[in-house]
Interface confidence: low
């Protein structure tokens, strides 16, 4: 699997969405996990409903948002109010018992404000940061990583 | 023998500012993910920031994220714990621990070092 | 984030005596899950990792198991030198949580 590769301005809110094949993963819950060095297990961050009927509801970890449409074959993972140290390597993962199948690996990368490389004359509208789904960044690119993913827990 | 050794703490008004300094010796610095965690008087712990052996990724706690910041130089051996906006609830312990071969298990431990924040 | 319930919170116990302290957490954690020894003064030690698995110089009575949501530390006969608090903490998830430790204490 290439790792995708998303930026996101610190502050703001960042959206992952993860595909993957709806009748294959039928049944099964999805999970985003974070990767702490370059071994050892995938630390869930969060994970969908417990009854999978009711995946598409959003569960929530301090600042990290999931939600499943089991139909469309798309798991979303959002990371609110994003800071530099949520810049790391992630995955998306289909949970089937105590296995776990990777669907994506991502790399979040944390970008400063820009108003902190302009001149103080300057005036900036901040963005509207109320409402669940504003100020998203979905800048994404794909690029092969060197890292490696063990199992996880 | 693996040996850690917190420095830094110290008495602090709310809002004001501390860096605590862990120096590390007996293994290969570089190899290993480092911790902070904190014990606040009385209480249990808590993990606060984590930092891969390279220094490039970097993992806080909901209750420090945007005021603490970790960092390491592998040259000089050293763990850093930049506390800013310091409020009453982050007068602990702090202690630097080894994180052994990525896991987030704390194989070694220094001794500690408080942390008052008080006016 | 996870949350780590210990019980007993106190267990008064004589030396020779066995310690069994319980973990629970609020979901699976799998099998990672440590425990630790702390006594007054002084940083935590690490005894189990992995639930089970006896960190480096950790004597033989003291022994981790279970797995996912219930865990146990059992102390085969206490020591003198074992009187203190025990956490346990999980890295399944993250952040990383402590128990709220249970105090073992001379009866």
């Known amino acids: 699997l290439n790792t995708t590769v998303l930026q996101g301005m610190a502050g703001q809110s960042l959206r992952v969405s993860c595909t993957y094949d709806a009748l294959k993963h039928w049944g099964r819950r999805k999970a985003w996990c974070r990767q702490l060095g370059e071994e050892g297990p995938c630390q869930r961050v969060v994970s969908t409903h417990g009854v999978w009927l009711l995946a598409f509801l959003k569960k929530r970890n301090g600042s990290t948002v999931i939600a499943d449409d089991t139909l469309a074959g798309t798991v979303t993972i959002t990371l609110k109010n994003l800071q530099a140290g949520d810049a790391g390597l992630y995955q998306c993962q289909s949970l089937r018992g105590r296995e776990a199948e990777v669907l994506q690996k991502v790399l979040v990368e944390v970008l400063e404000d820009p108003l902190d490389d302009q001149d103080a004359g300057d005036l900036w509208v901040p963005e509207e940061s109320s409402s669940f789904e504003g100020a998203q960044v979905e800048h994404s690119t794909s690029r092969n990583q060197e890292t490696s993913f063990p199992p996880t827990s | 023998e693996v040996q850690l050794l917190e420095s830094g703490g110290g008495l602090v008004q709310p809002g004001g500012s501390l860096r605590l300094s862990c120096a590390a010796s007996?293994?290969?610095?570089?190899?290993?993910?480092m911790s902070w965690v904190r014990q606040a008087p009385g209480k249990g712990l808590e993990w606060v920031s984590a930092i891969s052996g390279s220094g490039g990724s970097t993992y806080y706690a909901d209750s420090v994220k945007g005021r603490f910041t970790i960092s390491r130089d592998n040259s000089k051996n050293t763990l850093y714990l930049q506390m800013n906006s310091l409020r009453a609830e982050d007068t602990a312990v702090y202690y630097c621990?080894?994180?052994?071969?990525?896991?987030?298990?704390?194989?070694?431990w220094g001794q500690g070092t408080l942390v008052t924040v008080s006016s | 984030e996870i949350v780590l319930t210990q019980s007993p919170a106190t267990l008064s116990l004589s030396p020779g005596e066995r310690a069994t302290l319980s973990c629970r957490a609020s979901?699976?954690?799998?099998?990672?899950l440590a425990w630790y020894q702390q006594k007054p003064g002084q940083a935590p030690r690490l005894l189990i990792y992995d639930a089970s698995n006896r960190a480096t110089g950790i004597p033989a009575r003291f022994s981790g198991s279970g797995s996912g949501t219930d865990f146990t530390l059992t102390i085969s006969s206490l020591e003198p030198e074992d009187f203190a608090v025990y956490y346990c903490q999980q890295y399944s998830f993250f952040p990383p949580t402590f128990g709220g430790g249970t105090k073992v204490e001379i009866k």
């Open positions: 007996g293994f290969t610095f570089s190899s290993y993910a």
């Open positions: 621990a080894r994180v052994p071969k990525h896991y987030v298990v704390l194989d070694y």
């Open positions: 979901q699976s954690v799998s099998s990672y």
